[in-house]
Interface confidence: medium
């Protein structure tokens, strides 16, 4: 028995009640006063949290009972107060005393993994002993009672690749794994309390372990030989065909690059399709069946990213042989020149040969040609490619002709090619000079001798290699016209001067002056031009601007050419 030092009359045992008792009334012990002689004169009372609901006292004997199942993990200690009263007087026999009921642990809680789900990633081919993940189980039981909360970990599933340290829950690799064979492992770890002894409770957890990829595989061509065909007419950049290598690795480790080997002509190239990792063989230069009908090239494939320590796995890169057959294409005719410039003098009779164009069939059969000409009705072409005139050409009408010659193969009229032919008509001196404009010339009645009446100039429709040079002269035939004289200024202009003082409008209202103009062509051409001079009433001034009858003659139509 235990006697409380402060409350000397109280006697009780240490009170323990096992948790999880299924009985509805469990006797815990007895509280009594040493003054109680057993004649039922005392009444015992229980106070505090749990009194009357969880714990009950027999008022007569002081026996204490637990009437509810207790859970140590919920509450491990109850502090209650006891009273003992004399029934006769209603007074306390002893001072109120505090006592403790301890709930003793049973192993009723299994270890639980609170951090689920467990997921880990570890590189494939990791060596034995590599740390993967640590799992931890918790046991709600009392760690100070036996081994109720002492946990041992055990691998239920995952051998022979993984192991677990029994006391720490650290999972390690115990055998190398190849992601390309299996990429995910499901490991089951069991945690047992009681250090795994009989009566132990257990809990399990699943650990999902993913192997991350390392670049331990080189790409290998699916086929050792590829045959492709390409038309000789295919433009640069044309895709000839696809080659494919496979790599058991994933992601960046499977990224590959293709290259062309043994292609001295540098006709082909390989680009990669990043989505499919296929190599696309493309044309880098034009091919010509007549020049070479097939090509044999070799392609190589290797990874883009290789770690130094994994380089040994990537020696002897995979190669494949590619045969490219060039298909003969019925090609259109080819002109000897990309364009032609021909010359012909103007004024030649129709049927004159301008020049010859020539096209040939690049194919082996060398088809004869047929030619067609468009762009002008002044020309025609025969089956030999000779261009002739169909009219006399006048440079002053057209100095250039832009013609198109079309050549078709006789055997296949669908095969057509065209070339531009530029015909230049060059000048011959076939145009005499003439007045550059129509002159309305006036002379005042009171004009003085030597006075300038008109400055004239000329034009010539001919083309001149050097600058035109014109010569002016008074026609020898114009004997009756001595009232005016002409002076050549030597600059392609001439001046008409009055050769007398005074004119009479009424007597001689109009003068016609015949002027000869010659060019400097070979041979020189001369024209006769008439200048009409009207006498004018200028009043007191000698300025033709004030002429009263100005323009009347020209308006009335007395103009003579």
């Amino acid at each position: 028995d235990y006697k409380d030092d402060d409350d000397k009359g109280w006697v009780w045992n240490q009170f323990f009640v096992p948790e999880e008792m299924n009985t509805t009334s469990h006797h815990i012990g007895q509280l009594r006063s040493d003054l109680d002689n057993g004649n039922n004169s005392f009444q015992y009372k229980l106070l505090g949290a749990g009194a009357g609901s969880t714990f009950i006292i027999d008022e007569r004997t002081g026996d204490i009972y637990a009437i509810q199942k207790l859970d140590r993990e919920e509450r491990s200690l109850y502090i209650l107060r006891a009273q003992v009263i004399d029934i006769a007087t209603g007074r306390a026999v002893e001072p109120e005393s505090e006592f403790v009921i301890k709930v003793s642990d049973i192993n009723d809680n299994e270890p639980r993994f609170l951090d689920e789900p467990y997921e880990a990633i570890v590189p494939e081919m990791s060596p034995e002993g590599t740390f993967v993940i640590k799992v931890t189980a918790n046991d709600a039981d009392d760690p100070s009672t036996g081994y109720h909360a002492r946990i041992l970990y055990n691998l239920e599933r995952g051998q022979p690749y993984f192991s677990v340290e029994p006391t720490t829950g650290v999972i390690r690799i115990s055998s190398k794994m190849d992601r390309e064979l299996q990429d995910t492992y499901c490991v089951i770890i069991q945690a047992k309390d009681m250090l795994g002894q009989p009566g132990a409770l257990s809990g399990t957890t699943t650990v999902s372990i993913k192997l991350s990829d390392i670049n331990d595989n080189k790409p290998i061509f699916k086929e050792s030989f590829y045959r492709f065909t390409i038309s000789e007419s295919a433009p640069i950049g044309t895709s000839i065909g696809k080659i494919m290598a496979y790599d058991d690795d994933i992601g960046e480790n499977a990224e590959m690059e293709y290259s062309i080997e043994d292609d001295d002509s540098k006709i082909f190239d390989i680009i990669i399709d990043n989505d499919t990792q296929e190599g696309i063989v493309i044309l880098k230069k034009k091919v010509d069946f007549e020049q070479q009908s097939y090509y044999g090239i070799r392609a190589k494939v290797k990874n883009c990213h290789v770690d130094e320590e994994l380089a040994p796995a990537h020696v002897n890169a995979s190669t494949t042989y590619i045969k490219v057959q060039v298909e003969d294409e019925d090609e259109p005719p080819v002109f000897l020149l990309p364009y032609y410039i021909l010359e012909i003098p103007e004024g030649k009779p129709y049927g004159t040969i301008v020049g010859t164009v020539s096209a040939t069939d690049p194919d082996r059969r060398q088809s004869p040609m047929r030619y067609y000409l468009t762009g002008s009705k002044m020309f025609d072409i025969n089956d030999n490619g000779t261009i002739i005139t169909t009219n006399m050409l006048d440079r002053e009408v057209s100095a250039w002709y832009n013609l198109t010659v079309t050549a078709t193969e006789t055997y296949n009229v669908q095969q057509i090619s065209s070339a531009h032919v530029y015909v230049q008509v060059f000048n011959i001196n076939d145009n005499a000079p003439e007045f550059s404009q129509f002159y309305e010339t006036y002379v005042c009645e009171n004009a003085e001798s030597g006075e300038i009446v008109q400055i004239i100039s000329a034009i010539d429709r001919d083309e001149s290699i050097e600058d035109h040079h014109f010569y002016f002269n008074h026609s020898l035939e114009d004997t009756n016209n001595s009232s005016f004289m002409l002076t050549d200024n030597q600059d392609n202009t001439a001046v008409i001067l009055s050769n007398r003082t005074g004119f009479n409008l009424k007597e001689e209202p109009v003068f016609y002056m015949i002027i000869l103009i010659a060019d400097n062509g070979i041979p020189s051409l001369t024209s006769t031009n008439t200048l009409t001079i009207q006498v004018c009433d200028c009043g007191d001034s000698r300025n033709t601007e004030t002429c009263a009858n100005k323009g009347l003659l020209f308006i009335m139509g007395f103009r003579t050419e």
Epitope: T23, T24, S25, H27, G38, N40, G52, S53, I56, D58, E59, R60, T61, D63, Y65, I67
Partner: antibody
Framework: QVQLVQSGAEVKKPGASVKVSCKAS????????MSWVRQAPGQGLEWMGI????????TYAQKFQGRVTMTRDTSTSTVYMELSSLRSEDTAVYYC?????????????WGQGTLVTVSS | QSVLTQPPSASGTPGQRVTISCSGS????????VNWYQQLPGTAPKLLIY???QRPSGVPDRFSGSKSGTSASLAISGLQSEDEADYYC???????????FGGGTKLTVLG
């Protein structure tokens, strides 16, 4: 596990006495009260009294005062109920039941019952 | 004549909810804990509910007890055929200084 095993059926004449035993096992005998409850044929339950095996203290229902005696033998963990001056209306099944102190304690375990027939 | 009053009978079909009442006075239900017992035909009574609303282990949670003032009730939800039995309420009576039982209610599961 807790078990209460009662003695066999009895047939008694009016005026006689009957003593029914109840042997307890599976728990600390002296820590729990024992009550006696009877049930007449086709009738309800009727509480007769209680004994504390530790000190032998008893409390009897008013109706049976003077006619019933409850005793115990701690050495054999057995309680006894003796009913005297039997009448025909005492014909019933008599049960011992663990528990029954004031205020709280219920009857958590019951014996299988003993049929007492009072007949002339 | 019992100190505690119970209806003599009650019935329900499987799956239904049935309530059995127990009426007393201040000296019994009004002052003390109520217990309920189930007695299957030909067997000893069995503790069903103690201290008003507690269920011993092994008793299904379809059974529940409650107390209010001087009355108590037992509710059975999701009625099953094996629930067919007599049900008794019991409580300590301070005036009589002893245990009193209700007259019992015979529960019949129909159909």
């Amino acid at each position: 596990q807790v078990q209460l095993v009662q003695s066999g059926a009895e047939v008694k004449k009016p005026g006689a006495s009957v003593k029914v035993s109840c042997k307890a096992s599976g728990y600390t005998f002296t820590s729990y009260y024992m009550s006696w409850v009877r049930q007449a044929p086709g009738q309800g339950l009727e509480w007769m009294g209680i004994i504390h095996p530790s000190g032998g203290d008893t409390t009897y229902a008013q109706k049976f005062q003077g006619r019933v005696t409850m005793t115990r033998d701690t050495s054999t963990s057995t309680v006894y109920m003796e009913l005297s001056s039997l009448r025909s209306e005492d014909t019933a099944v008599y049960y011992c039941a663990r528990g029954g102190i004031k205020l709280w304690l219920h009857f958590d375990y019951w014996g299988q019952g003993t049929l007492v027939t009072v007949s002339s | 004549q019992s100190v505690l009053t119970q209806p003599p009978s009650a019935s329900g079909t499987p799956g239904q909810r049935v309530t059995i009442s127990c009426s007393g006075s201040r000296s019994n239900i009004g002052s003390n804990f109520v217990n309920w017992y189930q007695q299957l035909p030909g067997t000893a009574p069995k503790l069903l509910i103690y201290t008003n609303n507690q269920r011993p282990s092994g008793v299904p949670d379809r059974f529940s007890g409650s107390k209010s003032g001087t009355s108590a009730s037992l509710a059975i939800s999701g009625l099953q055929s094996e629930d067919e039995a007599d049900y008794y309420c019991a409580v300590w009576d301070d005036s009589l200084n002893g245990w009193v039982f209700g007259g019992g209610t015979k529960l019949t599961v129909l159909g």
